[in-house]
């Protein structure tokens, strides 16, 4: 039985040029965490595995940059970066937990971080 | 075009050391991390280790983790591949393969070096 | 380490006729498996990637299925040109291993 759940950042909002940190947090199981692949939308970004180290995507290696921890760094934003982002942790021998994350990046100063909330957890056994 | 051009064939005394070099062109060489895979004679594929060129930062496979060392030179955009203590079951094809898009696999590899370890 | 295990060994099949290639893996690896070709004197070549992905340039009589444990490569129609040697390799941990590999020939 999966115990575990997401803690996420919730919903982030950072200015045009600036930059943000996409974290998410297992809690809940003992479950060992392999990889944490981040996505944006269907695209992804970066995985994080536990024997390998870091992946990150070619498209995004300018400005994606890894951490802290498990999360990942998103620099020089842009308006076209809002949008959903989803943390995907495999583990073992739990599966599959994914978090989300809205992210509005804002033209002007007026970007606020949203509190931290809880996502219910997705999950699938393969 | 993507090309990764590697070095000519070695062949070594045991004991000594190899270093093999890889040439990439045709993309950007720092946005791509870089894989070395060895293939001993009518054997199958053995990985050896992989890096990131932008940092430096590497990752191998235990079983050389003591005698293997890849580095990269940003300014040529080569990569490079020793491997020390040399040997006979060394003696191998050794293909540098540029990581995919989407994670560890290899698209684009390298046209192999022969590595030849005999006393 | 990941195992990884190829059936068959090796097989034969007519000009325009289905190949199927099995890989097992000992332990679950999600989709995180790839495909490669390699000729006899060449280097490998990428076909699929996360288990069912077609490489760029690759043609579409060769796909990827399964998850897990249990994985398929499938020529659906075999050409002259796919006599080679098919290893599957799980991406998902360290090290990177390979399957020993299967030859495919022409009956």
């Known amino acids: 039985m999966m115990t575990g759940t997401i803690e996420t950042t919730g919903n982030i909002s950072a200015e045009k040029g600036g930059s943000i940190i996409l974290q998410c947090h297992l809690s809940s199981t003992t479950a060992q965490v392999t990889q944490v692949n981040w996505e944006q939308q269907d695209q992804l970004l970066a995985i994080c595995n536990a024997d390998l180290g870091w992946h990150i995507s070619p498209s995004f290696k300018d400005r994606v940059a890894p951490g802290p921890g498990l999360g990942l760094t998103l620099q020089s934003l842009t308006v076209n970066d809002t949008g959903e982002y989803f943390c995907i942790y495999h583990t073992y021998p739990d599966g599959t937990y994914t978090g989300r994350i809205f992210l509005e990046v804002l033209e002007s100063s007026v970007a606020e971080h949203g509190a931290r909330f809880q996502i219910p957890h997705h999950h699938h056994h393969h | 075009e993507v090309q990764l051009v590697q070095s000519g064939a070695e062949v070594k005394k045991p004991g000594a050391s190899v270093k093999v070099s890889c040439k990439a062109s045709g993309y950007t060489f720092t946005n791509y991390y870089m894989h070395w895979v060895r293939q001993a004679p009518g054997q199958g594929l053995e990985w050896m280790g992989r890096i990131d060129p932008d940092s430096g930062g590497s990752k191998y496979n235990e079983k050389f983790k003591s005698r293997v060392t890849i580095t990269v030179d940003k300014l040529s955009s080569t990569a490079y591949m020793e491997l020390s203590s040399l040997r006979s079951e060394d003696t191998a094809v050794y293909y540098c393969?540029?990581?995919?898009?989407?994670?560890?696999?290899?698209?684009?590899w390298g046209q192999g070096t022969t590595v030849t370890v005999s006393s | 380490d990941i195992v990884m295990t190829q059936s068959p060994d090796s097989l034969a099949v007519s000009l325009g006729e289905r190949a199927t290639i099995n890989c097992r893996v000992s332990e679950n690896i999600y989709s995180y498996l790839a495909w490669y070709q390699q000729k006899p004197g060449q280097s490998p070549k990428l076909l699929v990637y996360?288990?069912?992905t077609l490489a760029e340039g690759v043609p579409d009589r060769f796909s990827g299925s399964g998850s897990g444990t249990d994985f398929t490569l499938t020529i659906s129609s075999l050409q002259a040109e796919d006599v080679a040697v098919y290893y599957c390799?799980?991406?998902?941990?360290?090290?990177?291993?390979f399957g020993p590999g299967t030859k495919v020939d022409i009956k």
């Open positions: 390799q799980h991406h998902y941990g360290n090290p990177l291993t």
């Open positions: 996360n288990a069912k």
């Open positions: 393969a540029r990581e995919g898009h989407y994670g560890f696999y290899s698209d684009y």
